[in-house]
């Protein structure tokens, strides 16, 4: 069927396939130093690693893409590892009227898949 | 601010950056020839191309990823070109009781962005 099961075991060896990894970043790294007050350092979960055939396929499109990449690697790219969901992050920042608390819903990845 | 505007002009030259491209595929290519009756050939729109800094950023996470990739290219991958939306496709396929029409919502890409 169109919905072949995406596979979850990495054929490339431990840590090589699409997964979540934490990257420490300062506000200076992000260019936000002048307006975010806290936290000054963020634990940024990001999606890294390769997407071998049918590994963690996001959907039918990704499964097709994986298959066509096998047939036409120069024309169709392999699926790549991107966030499937996000964890909201709360930042305190300076505003004209003082300090504001704001939530960013799309800043830190919570899960990854191959799309 | 966290929401810097994603840029839409490709600095790499025409056709090099993330965009939608049509790929012709037969049911044999997809491995569906034994259960899909029609269409026998599909026009599959796929997302291809590179994601230079801040080009068509999907969201804040993608903007951060682009920035950190610039600082730590070995640790943080560049954003990659994936579907932002899909076009439903209707396939006619064989079932135990005859022939059925089924809509696939996530088969053909409609738009692309860098995630």
């Amino acid at each position: 069927s169109a919905h072949a099961h995406p596979r979850d075991s990495c054929p490339l060896g431990p840590g090589r396939c699409c997964h979540l990894e934490t990257v420490q970043a300062t506000l200076e790294d992000l260019g936000w130093s002048d307006w975010v007050l806290s936290p000054r350092q963020l634990q940024l979960s990001m999606c890294v690693g390769e997407c071998p055939h049918l590994y963690r396929s996001a959907n039918t499109h990704a499964q097709i893409k994986a298959r066509l990449h096998g047939l036409q690697p120069d024309k169709v790219p392999a699926p790549c590892c991107v966030p499937s969901s996000y964890t909201p992050v709360v930042l305190m920042h300076r505003t004209d009227s003082g300090v504001s608390l704001q939530t960013y819903d799309d800043l830190v990845a919570r899960g990854c898949h191959c799309a | 601010s966290a929401h810097a505007h994603p840029r839409d002009s490709c600095p790499l030259g025409p056709g090099r950056c993330c965009h939608l491209e049509t790929v012709q595929a037969t049911l044999e290519d997809l491995g569906w020839s034994d259960w899909v009756l029609s269409p026998r050939q599909l026009q599959l729109s796929m997302c291809v191309g590179e994601c230079p800094h801040l080009y068509r950023s999907a969201n804040t996470h993608a903007q951060i990823k682009a920035r950190l990739h610039g600082l730590q290219p070995d640790k943080v991958p560049a954003p990659c070109c994936v579907p932002s939306s899909y076009t439903p496709v209707v396939l006619m396929h064989r079932t135990d009781s005859g022939v059925s029409l089924q809509t696939y919502d996530d088969l053909v890409a409609r738009g692309c962005h860098c995630a």
Epitope: S38, V90, S100, T103 | -
Partner: antibody, heavy 118, light 107 residues
């Protein structure tokens, strides 16, 4: 590991002031803000305000505005909360609570009991 | 300010039973809600943040759900150490506000 250690219990007369300290360790002090939360005996939790350990910017609960001052000393990684013109209904356990990037916080001081009594 | 209302004020449950605690916000707080557990003489302990994410080290019997204005904390099978007061907290807007608490006691 992250630790917040607060100063000891205080007994004050109405109209006096109290200054509670909160010494932080186990993390870079100026990377996170500090909230102050209080709890009157047998009552719920009340947020008093927040201070950026990086810049000193503050946000106070409206009902305490003018009576409360929050400060930090980055050289000693210590946050302070001063409450003036004390009244009997200020009798409470006062907690310092470190920010996290996810909103809720697992990092609380042990609490400081302030008793206001004539 | 956003008013957080918890119900019931007291919940009597037998060990091993399921406990369901409710928290309602006077306006939407999205998913910016935390749950804390507090035992006598102790500081509150974070259980859940983001309405449904368990904090580090919190047992799987604790689960949170809801978004907007209606939230639930469920303790699937109460252990003796779970009898305590539970508070919800919104951090969508300043001032940060807490619910009045639900005391979970032994039936």
């Amino acid at each position: 590991q992250v630790q917040l250690v607060q100063s000891g219990a205080e007994v004050k007369k109405p109209g006096a002031s109290v200054k509670v300290s909160c010494k932080a360790s186990g993390y870079t002090f100026d990377s996170y803000g500090i909230n102050w939360v209080r709890q009157a005996p047998g009552q719920g939790l009340e947020w008093m305000g927040w201070i950026s350990a990086y810049s000193g910017d503050t946000a106070y609960a409206q009902e305490l505005q003018g009576r409360v001052t929050m400060t930090t000393d980055t050289s000693t990684s210590t946050a302070y909360m001063e409450l003036r013109s004390l009244r009997s209904d200020d009798t409470a356990v006062y907690y310092c609570v470190r920010d996290t990037q996810y909103g809720g916080s697992p990092y609380w001081g042990q609490g400081t009991l302030v008793t206001v009594s004539s | 300010e956003i008013v957080m209302t918890q119900s019931p004020a007291t919940l009597s449950v037998s060990p091993g039973e399921r406990a369901t605690l409710s928290c309602r916000a006077s306006q939407s707080v999205s998913s910016n809600l935390a749950w804390y557990q507090q035992k006598p003489g102790q500081a509150p302990r974070l259980l859940i943040y983001g309405a449904s994410t368990r904090a580090t080290g919190i047992p799987a019997r604790f689960s949170g759900s809801g978004s907007g204005t209606e939230f639930t904390l469920t303790i699937s099978s109460l252990q003796s150490e779970d009898f305590a007061v539970y508070y919800c907290q919104q951090y969508n807007n300043w001032p940060i506000t807490f619910g009045g608490g639900t005391k979970v006691e032994i039936k």
